[in-house]
Amino acid sequence: TIPPHVQKSVNNDMIVTDNNGAVKFPQLCKFCDVRFSTCDNQKSCMSNCSITSICEKPQEVCVAVWRKNDENITLETVCHDPKLPYHDFILEDAASPKCIMKEKKKPGETFFMCSCSSDECNDNIIFSEEYNTSNPDLLLVIFQ
């Protein structure tokens, strides 16, 4: 996708719908590209990205990529079309409303990626599959 500061004029007159026939509209996502992160050994983290962008295309979803190597930890937040691979991986969880991190095999680093389809869902990245934000105790942890 194109970052907000260099977005081009696009006009796709086709109405984009999901599998249930619901209209898809450009999503709101955190979009800070790659930033250094302090997120480590936690069940969930906030992105600490202050930029919320309207994605360029209605079919795009929010993506977060967490990477750790010997030197640093980074978190990448973007919009991306799930029909296209990202970092050579398919966005298999793009329909999820939450960004549930899945580990991917990358030599020389620990690499987690998630994608999701609710507004700004890549702001809260979740590493524990059992994690459920309907649990009020966990909500207190996140939003304090």
């Epitope: 977005q7 309207i54 409303p97 507004d119 996140i142």
Partner: antibody
Framework: QVQLVESGGGLVEPGGSLRLSCAAS????????MSWVRQAPGKGLEWVGR??????????EFAAPVKGRFTISRDDSKNTLYLQMNSLKTEDTAVYYC???????WGQGTLVTVSS | DIQMTQSPSSLSASVGDRVTITCRAS??????LNWYQQKPGKAPKLLIY???SLQSGVPSRFSGSGSGTDFTLTISSLQPEDFATYYC?????????FGQGTKVEIK
């Protein structure tokens, strides 16, 4: 297609309360930030407030003139957005629009008149 | 709050004219600017988002440009259905704020 239909507007005395509803259809309501925007007669557009998705805690934000008097809630099971307006003032008189936050879909608006 | 100032507040133009409306932000908003069109008694309609991205279904005679504090909405060849009021809105920070509007009238 996407539809946003507001209801609940009407005439109310200063200091009174009113609850507006917005019934949404044609899109995945639970995934979307929603906003209320108002327009006083013959005036420009004024953002009232927003509610984020339940997935991210359903946080709300408000414009300064309504903060502490208005609340926004959502019922994702009913695809409905609400605006609870308390301690209404004459300057709250306006057409109130329900909108898909920062994007193209708006309701037709419902008129709220605050007058004695 | 970020103040948005539109100019002119109104203009008269003829069908076929090229029309330019400007919007200035009180501080830099990067490209976080939307343009809306509103006709009397109707809800606003989004034309342009992210300063230059044309909303689906909007005719290509509408275009947007600018970044930072200065933005422009251009209608390359005014059509009868374009006579309306146009608003800019910043989405850079909360609260999102609108310009006061520019009314485009028939000359």
């Amino acid at each position: 297609q996407v539809q946003l239909v507001e209801s609940g507007g009407g005439l109310v005395e200063p200091g009174g309360s009113l609850r507006l509803s917005c019934a949404a259809s044609g899109f995945t309501f639970a995934n979307a930030w929603m906003s209320w925007v108002r327009q006083a007669p013959g005036k420009g557009l004024e953002w009232v407030g927003r509610i984020k998705t339940t997935y991210s805690g359903g946080a709300t934000e408000f414009a300064a003139p309504v903060k502490g008097r208005f609340t926004i809630s959502r019922d994702d099971s009913k695809n409905t957005l609400y605006l609870q307006m308390n301690s209404l003032k004459t300057e709250d008189t306006a057409v109130y629009y329900c909108t898909l936050d920062l994007r193209t879909y708006w309701g037709q608006g419902t008129l709220v008149t605050v007058s004695s | 709050d970020i103040q948005m100032t539109q100019s002119p507040s109104s203009l008269s133009a003829s069908v076929g004219d090229r029309v330019t409306i400007t919007c200035r932000a009180s501080q830099s908003i990067s490209s976080y600017l939307n343009w809306y069109q509103q006709k009397p008694g109707k809800a606003p309609k989004l034309l342009i988002y992210a300063a230059s991205s044309l909303q689906s279904g909007v005719p290509s005679r509408f275009s947007g440009s600018g970044s930072g504090t200065d933005f422009t909405l251009t209608i390359s060849s005014l059509q009868p259905e374009d006579f309306a009021t146009y608003y800019c809105q910043q989405s850079y920070s909360t609260p999102p704020t609108f310009g006061q509007g520019t009314k485009v009238e028939i000359k």
